[in-house]
Interface confidence: medium
């Protein structure tokens, strides 16, 4: 038996920020798990991790120099990623398990997200117009 | 046919350290949660490490944060607990046990590895 995870097929962080949900099937209220948002096609760098726990607090961190938070629904978590790079442009997979109560759970792998990040360009300013032309 | 095989146990001194291992056959671990369970005469039964799943999360009893770690490795089908900074309160018998079904309950056992740390 495994959870169902949905995400937005794509997202464009333009101020170099973006909030992914992962929506389940699965209502996460009192449970113990683990929520990570994976990088890549081979989710080989875990960005961020969100973990519950029924009777604590939540816990968010990243291991990998991602700026992130977490947020909890009962049948979602997202993820609030900032000082994104346009280098991190890539597919992100939503991951869950479930180690309480029994039996363990996790998901099937997900579509993905693709997370386009746009770089900051800077526009030239009208107070300080381009040399005019005699 | 589930079974598991815990190896490891022995005579330590007070500060020393030893390597359980748990053999799982029958299924596979990174589809549960594996368990280092231990009893001592005269003291309650106690979950002292537990991992989960193929991402590996685990808990800790209190009394052994920071000296024990678990792990395992999914190719083996093996589970792992690390004791180190070993105090005579260790001494008992570990247990490896698999798939939960009610917290701290679990279906399956392994027959035991016994610690004993005096010096």
């Known amino acids: 038996n495994k959870i169902l995870v949905k995400q937005s097929p794509m997202l464009v962080a333009y101020d170099n920020a973006v909030n992914l949900s992962c929506k389940y099937s699965y209502n996460l209220f009192s449970r113990e798990f683990r929520a990570s948002l994976h990088k890549g096609l081979d989710s080989a760098v875990e960005v961020c991790v969100v973990y519950g726990n029924y009777s604590q607090q939540l816990q968010v961190y990243s291991k990998t120099g991602f700026n992130c938070d977490g947020k909890l629904g009962n049948e979602s978590v997202t993820f609030y990623l900032q000082n994104l790079y346009v280098n991190q442009t890539d597919i992100y997979f939503c991951k869950i398990e479930v180690m309480y109560p029994p039996p363990y759970l996790d998901n099937e792998k997900s579509n993905g997200t693709i997370i386009h990040v746009k770089g900051k360009h800077l526009c030239p300013s009208p107070l300080f117009p381009g040399p005019s032309k005699p | 046919e589930v079974q598991l095989v815990e190896s490891g146990g022995g005579l330590v001194q007070p500060g020393g350290s030893l390597r359980l291992s748990c053999a799982a056959s029958g299924f596979n671990i990174k589809d549960t949660c594996i368990g280092w369970v231990r009893r001592a005469p005269g003291k309650e039964e106690e979950l002292v490490a537990r991992?989960?799943?193929?991402?590996?999360?685990?808990r800790y009893a209190d009394s052994v944060k920071g000296r024990f770690t678990i792990s395992a490795d999914t190719s083996k089908n093996t589970a792992y607990l690390q004791m180190n900074s070993l105090r005579a309160e260790d001494t008992a018998v570990y247990y490896c046990?698999?798939?939960?079904?009610?917290?701290?309950?679990?279906?399956?056992w392994g027959q035991g590895t016994t610690v004993t740390v005096s010096s």
């Open positions: 046990a698999a798939q939960p079904r009610y917290y701290d309950v679990y279906d399956y």
């Open positions: 991992i989960c799943g193929e991402y590996g999360s685990t």
